[in-house]
Interface confidence: low
């Protein structure tokens, strides 16, 4: 019977202290005087001195009030010894349980909670959860059992009970239909947490509920009818800006407009885009409109949002009547670029070609022609007929004006509209080669020794094209063949000049006649410097002076 049942002590006791709790008693006290002591946290180890024992009587004493939230249970050991200090009992376990009092208020984990819910949701939709804690006991008592409630709602639109809070979990839910972001985008709820399961101390916090936008408003055209005027042929021309209003959140997918041309654009002439800031529909021409083909287009445009509608909404349609305005269109050369083959060197006044333009306009407008760019001044153009004639010598070999056998001319056509308009065409004359150039040797100056002379190789060039070029033939004239020989190589594109008799040091003219495959002959004088030397030389050596 050296046993003590668990001892319950309420926290926050009023005293007086020390307060007797229970008596330790060993039945060995019949035989000998017993001394009692206690050990453990709360007695002889921290927190020391909370409990003590009357040494001779065994009364267990409480020295000060207890705090359950600090220590809820003390585990001590009781000891019994005889006068000589010998232990007469095994150490006894003493359990002291601190019972709870409602000495703490609930505390919300935040002063302000934020949550969000989509507008238009059904009652029962969960919004957010708030949490409050209470340090008191919630297992054996209701002291720490928190009950949640909503104290107030701001604003009170459409009425003051839009939300409910679960009494025990703190989950805030929608309780009424009618959440409309366009009317109230945010609610402020004052929430309460009360301990004793709703009958005790209360604390408050704020829950801010943001109402998120849903696409519950269709964009509407304002106005719904438009008239626009567009000049024909204009591409990328802004025809009309269509304006819509949408009550959903600006710059959100539920507000941003998407436009669609539903009808009236048979030729795919129009396109419509959304202006990123104003949300307007910008109707522009994708292709040029043709007044002569169709002078009025009636378009039907529908508007929706980037985001789908969350409920069935009627879509808005706009009607745009586009009047095409007649424009004096420029004459167009047919074809825009004309290639004509013509022989070079044709006689002055000879016709080259006729190059004319057509006017898209329906009126019978008179077209006049003139040459806009004729770099060499070789051509003339009849202003009425568009007949192009040669007024200068067309020279295929003229490198200043002719590139790759082509001479490029720009011509202009002008109608008699008001104001007049002009169109340009390009005339590409492909000049056919005529054998009008003879072969020419290069170089035309040579230096040669009069003893053991080296053969001089001259390149032959001809500005004409094949077959008016190689193989070439060479012939020396005017007695040049007495001292010199001229031979064309096997390929027929170089001539080899050799000194065959001794000439004293001096400068001589060698008369060389070259003819091409078409027998076009060209006489060239080669200036030959003969030097007193042997073999190869580039310049004549000066006179030798003895010492």
């Amino acid at each position: 019977d050296w046993v003590v049942a668990p001892i319950s002590v309420p926290e926050n006791g009023k005293g007086p202290f020390p307060q007797r709790l229970n008596q330790l008693k060993s039945n060995k006290d019949r035989d000998t005087k017993i001394f009692y002591s206690i050990t453990g946290p709360g007695a002889d180890s921290p927190p020391e001195g909370v409990f003590a024992v009357e040494k001779e009587t065994g009364w267990l004493l409480l020295n000060k009030p207890l705090d359950r939230e600090e220590i809820a249970k003390y585990e001590l050991f009781g000891h019994a010894v005889s006068e000589n200090g010998a232990s007469v009992e095994d150490p006894m376990n003493i359990s002291i349980i601190v019972t709870d009092q409602n000495d703490h208020k609930p505390k919300f984990t935040q002063d302000t909670f934020r949550g969000s819910v989509l507008e238009g949701v059904l009652p029962g939709t969960s919004v957010m959860q708030v949490t409050a804690t209470d340090e008191d006991d919630a297992i054996y008592t209701y002291n720490g059992v928190v009950a949640y409630s909503i104290h107030s709602q701001e604003p009170k639109d459409p009425h003051d009970l839009m939300f409910t809070i679960h009494r025990s979990t703190g989950t805030i839910s929608v309780i009424s239909s009618g959440l409309d972001r366009e009317k109230v985008p945010e609610y402020t709820l004052t929430i309460q947490a009360t301990d004793m399961d709703g009958d005790g101390s209360t604390t408050t916090a704020v829950a801010v509920v943001e109402i998120l936008d849903a696409n519950d408003n269709a964009p509407m055209f304002d106005p719904q009818k438009y008239e626009a005027h567009v000049p024909e042929n204009a591409v990328g021309h802004e025809v009309q800006r269509l304006t819509v209003t949408d009550l959903d959140a600006p710059n959100s997918p539920a507000w941003r407009a998407t436009y669609l041309i539903m009808g009236g654009d048979d030729g795919d002439h129009f396109t419509i885009t959304t202006h990123p800031e104003s949300n307007q529909g910008i109707l522009t021409t994708r292709k040029g409109l043709d007044f002569e083909a169709k002078n009025q287009h009636t378009l039907y445009v529908e508007v929706t949002n980037e985001a789908p509608f969350v409920l069935k909404l009627p879509t808005s349609t706009a009607t745009i009547v586009v009047h095409v305005e007649d424009v004096n269109e420029a004459p167009v050369f047919v074809p825009p670029s004309k290639v004509v083959e013509v022989q070079e060197g044709i006689p002055t006044g000879e016709p080259v070609c006729v190059y004319t333009a057509e006017d898209p306009d329906k009126e019978n407008q008179k077209i006049s022609y003139r040459i806009l760019r004729d770099p060499a001044g070789w051509l003339a153009m009849d202003p009425d007929s568009g007949q192009v004639t040669a007024v200068g010598t067309l020279d295929r070999e003229d490198e200043q004006f002719v590139r790759n056998n082509i001479y490029e001319v720009m011509v202009l056509a002008m109608d008699n509209g008001s104001p007049p308009t002009t169109g340009t065409g390009t005339l590409l004359l492909t000049l056919i080669d005529v054998n009008d150039h003879g072969p020419v040797p290069e170089p035309r100056q040579i230096t040669i020794c009069n003893q053991s002379p080296v053969r001089q190789v001259l390149n032959i060039t001809d500005k004409d094209l094949s077959p008016h070029t190689s193989p070439f033939q060479a012939q020396l004239t005017d007695d040049s063949d007495i001292y010199w020989t001229a031979e064309v190589n096997e390929e027929g594109d170089t001539v080899v000049l050799s000194l065959k008799k001794f000439l004293k040091q001096d400068t001589y003219d060698v008369h060389l006649s070259l003819s091409d495959h078409g027998n076009k002959e060209q006489l060239t004088v080669i200036r030959a410097t003969v030097c007193d030397c042997h073999g190869h030389v580039e310049t004549c050596p000066g006179p030798w002076k003895g010492g």
């Epitope: 934020r114 109230v184 985008p185 704020v206 009550l247």
Partner: antibody, heavy 123, light 113 residues
Framework: QVQLQESGPGLVKPSETLSLTCTVS????????INWIRQPPGKGLEWIGV???????NYNPSLKSRVTISVDTSKNQFSLKLSSVTAADTAVYYC?????????????????WGQGTLVTVSS | DIVMTQSPDSLAVSLGERATINCKSS????????????LAWYQQKPGQPPKLLIY???TRESGVPDRFSGSGSGTDFTLTISSLQAEDVAVYYC?????????FGQGTKLEIK
């Protein structure tokens, strides 16, 4: 360019109702919330309340019993009414546009302000 | 209500030097769902309305010079002017929009030394 302009009487007698209007130009009047803020001479700023794009309102609890904010879309005007005024209500009153309608726009920050109008409460 | 406290009440800084204004809120302005701080900074010059400089604690409003920057999170925030210009002389206010009512700091007067 969005512009806001406050107007109303510069002098109001104690216990009477202060009435101001805010005219918005250069933008759709119903596209953004409009706030009212006041600033007593030489002092700091106090938020009075806001009217949302759909007409809902939220007021500062310290003024809630006396304040009404409303909108007249046909005139492009917002109005502020403050009843039972005292000398403590003497201030420059501003209307200011919220940055956006949506929370992610930074709705509570105010990007366009009127020049303000001084209202003196005195008998 | 959330109380906003600015420090210092007034500040004198030399031209070209850095100016720093602090703002403390009585509760956190950080919303965990979007990790944004619901705080704005305004500049008010004499006889003029306030001008929005910064929102979301650190996002510069368009047209505001890049010498203005905002930082901080939770309850402690800072407005910094990296190189003070003569035209920056004004009163600066912080404002919370985490919950209603919106509240402003008492203001910090910035002058040139």
């Amino acid at each position: 360019q969005v512009q806001l302009q406050e107007s109303g009487p510069g002098l109001v007698k104690p216990s009477e109702t202060l009435s101001l209007t805010c005219t918005v130009s250069g933008g759709s009047i119903t596209s953004y919330p409009i706030n009212w803020i006041r600033q007593p001479p030489g002092k700091g700023l106090e938020w009075i309340g806001v009217i949302w794009t759909g007409g809902g309102t939220n007021y500062n609890p310290s003024l809630k019993s006396r304040v009404t904010i409303s909108v007249d879309t046909s005139k492009n005007q917002f109005s502020l009414k403050l009843s039972s005024v005292t000398a403590a209500d003497t201030a420059v009153y501003y209307c200011a546009r919220s940055r956006g309608v949506y929370d992610f726009d930074g709705r509570g920050a105010m990007d366009y302000w009127g020049q303000g109008t001084l209202v003196t409460v005195s008998s | 209500d959330i109380v906003m406290t600015q420090s210092p009440d007034s500040l004198a800084v030399s031209l070209g030097e850095r100016a720093t204004i602090n703002c403390k809120s009585s509760q956190s302005l950080l919303y965990s769902s979007n990790q944004k701080n619901y705080l704005a900074w305004y500049q008010q010059k004499p006889g003029q309305p306030p001008k929005l400089l910064i929102y979301w604690a650190s996002t510069r409003e368009s047209g505001v010079p890049d010498r203005f920057s905002g930082s901080g999170s939770g309850t402690d925030f800072t407005l910094t002017i990296s190189s003070l210009q003569a035209e920056d002389v004004a009163v600066y206010y912080c404002q919370q929009y985490y919950s209603y009512p919106y509240t402003f700091g008492q203001g910090t007067k910035l002058e040139i030394k």
